[in-house]
Interface confidence: medium
């Protein structure tokens, strides 16, 4: 079996001119392609893999939501030579997710890593963005985490930072086929420079207060300890499925319209993102790996 092969990490690794072919090992009878797109309120990016796969032919699409970070995963496996170029793979720099100027900043700033390499997303080096509230959802938390896509015996991963709806999540994650988006949230501007070692203690948990030892005198102590119990109860899961996307146009011969860079669209916007102008759209450069798919 011969399959197309490429790896894309928020770049043009799977663009039309950059397509490779590989011969699969004996016994491997499916080609695979997987794309995972992540959207924050300040932009979007995608990971993609093509190559020789394992398992059965078929498709698996899924939409996920982690505290307002949206993820969309498409996995396709097929059993014909070079059949794994049907999905539109994102391979372009990503545009803002909407007209951000339409939303007033809510006062919180977060470090933003949208399609940045791990080197560019270290500590306080990433760009800072102003959070805003959209679709009746409050984005006052900052997030620090990772997105990982595994397919064709290849794992690609990129950091993710940005504004989210939760200020206290700790090591939360959502998963799809070969896909994981996980990380932690924090409260306060620019608090998400590094949450890798965040523990499960948060402001929502009343602090343990060490009382002073009793005085030897008999005078009654007027010291009082106040603990806040008004923190909202956190739901056990904040993961919400998103509508499945419309099916993508299968790869056609070059005599047909070039559509490698078209973004797959969800049939509907995810909750909390309906009014973002390109909600659910992920640039995708499917074809050969142009500059994008290095094919010329």
């Amino acid at each position: 079996l011969e399959c197309y092969s490429c790896v894309q990490k928020a770049d043009d690794g799977c663009s039309p001119n950059k397509m490779k072919t590989v011969k699969c090992a004996p016994g491997v009878d499916v080609c695979t392609e997987a794309v995972g797109a992540v959207e924050t309120i300040h932009g979007q990016f995608s990971l993609a893999v093509r190559g020789c796969g394992s398992g059965l032919p078929g498709k698996n699409d899924r939409g996920l939501d982690l505290h307002g970070l949206l993820a969309f995963i498409q996995l396709q496996q097929c059993a014909q030579d070079r059949c794994n170029a049907k999905l539109n793979l994102t391979s372009r720099a990503l545009d803002p997710a909407g007209n951000e100027s339409a939303y007033p900043p809510n006062g919180v700033e977060c470090y933003s890593c949208v399609g940045l390499s791990r080197e560019a997303c270290q500590g306080t080096s990433p760009p800072v963005v102003s959070c805003y509230n959209a679709s009746d959802h409050v984005y006052k938390g900052c997030f620090d985490g990772n997105v990982t896509l595994t397919a064709a015996n290849v794992t690609v991963s990129l950091p993710v930072r940005g504004c989210v709806q939760d200020e206290f999540c700790t090591r939360d994650g959502v998963t799809g086929p070969g896909f994981t988006l996980s990380g932690s949230c924090c409260q306060g501007s620019r608090c998400n420079s590094d949450l890798r070692n965040k523990t499960y203690f948060s402001p929502r948990i009343p602090p343990l207060v060490r009382l002073p030892p009793p005085e030897p005198t008999t005078v009654a102590s007027t010291t009082s300890v106040t603990t806040s119990t008004s923190a909202p109860v956190r739901p056990t899961s904040t993961t919400k499925p998103m509508p499945a996307p419309t099916s993508q146009t299968p790869r056609q011969g070059v005599e047909h319209e070039a559509s490698r860079d078209e973004e797959p669209r969800l049939t509907g916007g995810a909750a909390g993102h309906q009014d973002r102008s390109n909600s659910g759209q992920y640039p995708a450069k499917g074809g050969p790996q142009q500059p994008h798919n290095k094919g010329c």
């Epitope: 070039a258 074809g287 050969p288």
Partner: antibody, heavy 117, light 111 residues
């Protein structure tokens, strides 16, 4: 029918500038990656630059990097190539090409750029 | 000097089979990138002839075929016709140059 029509070529002095245009029709321009490829007189083909469908990603051959700028206006279905600091070796026919699946599947007829004093 | 190497000329008589080679390196064809072939008739723009190593766009006669092996590729034209007289270019992506590269072109003469 896919059509690509280049314009803007002409005679220019070394160090001068030119802006080439490519009017596209017959396909969804806003969904296609586009390229400029040139051919010096009597020579072979040389890729110059390409741009993603949204215009947010651009790429250049080393020979033109820093001097040429590719851009597009999807509302006008037009591709551009701004050429500055032109040199004699930039003399060529410049073709606008659509990047289809894997390859340059449609080409314009070309426009001649002559850099000479 | 072109990154992909082609013979500058080739010739054949009508009805013959002619093969044009395209030699690359480990940063382009040898890296697994697909090869394309373009035909440029005299005084016209190039036209895509073969893409993805061996695929023909609609409208291209099956007399034209492509193949690839290792760091090389080849274009075969069977049943040569006078209208096949043209320049033929191979192309592939190159990792080192980070862009598509072309062969120097082969001028095919039908005797």
């Amino acid at each position: 029918e896919v059509q690509l029509l280049e314009s803007g070529g002409g005679l220019v002095q070394p160090g001068g500038s030119l802006r080439l245009s490519c009017a596209a029709s017959g396909f969804t321009f806003s969904s296609a990656w586009m390229s400029w490829v040139r051919q010096a007189p009597g020579k072979g083909l040389e890729w110059v630059s390409y741009i993603s469908s949204s215009g947010s990603s651009t790429y250049y051959a080393d020979s033109v990097k820093g001097r040429f700028t590719i851009s597009r206006d999807n509302s006008k279905n037009t591709l551009y190539l701004q050429m500055n600091s032109l040199r004699a070796e930039d003399t060529a026919v410049y073709y606008c090409a659509r990047e289809g699946l894997w390859a340059f599947d449609y080409w314009g007829q070309g426009t001649l750029v002559t850099v000479s004093s | 000097e072109s990154v992909l190497t082609q013979p500058p000329s080739a010739s054949g008589t009508p009805g013959q089979r002619v093969t044009i080679s395209c030699s690359g390196s480990s940063s382009n064809i040898g890296a697994g990138y697909v090869v394309h072939w373009y035909q440029q008739l005299p005084g016209t723009a190039p036209k895509l002839l073969i893409y993805d190593n061996n695929q023909r766009p609609s409208g291209v006669p099956d007399r034209f075929s492509g193949s690839k092996s290792g760091t090389s590729a080849s274009l075969a034209i069977s049943g040569l016709r006078s209208e096949d007289e043209a320049d033929y270019y191979c192309a592939a992506w190159d990792d080192r140059l980070n862009g598509p590269v072309f062969g120097g072109g082969t001028k095919l003469t039908v005797l």
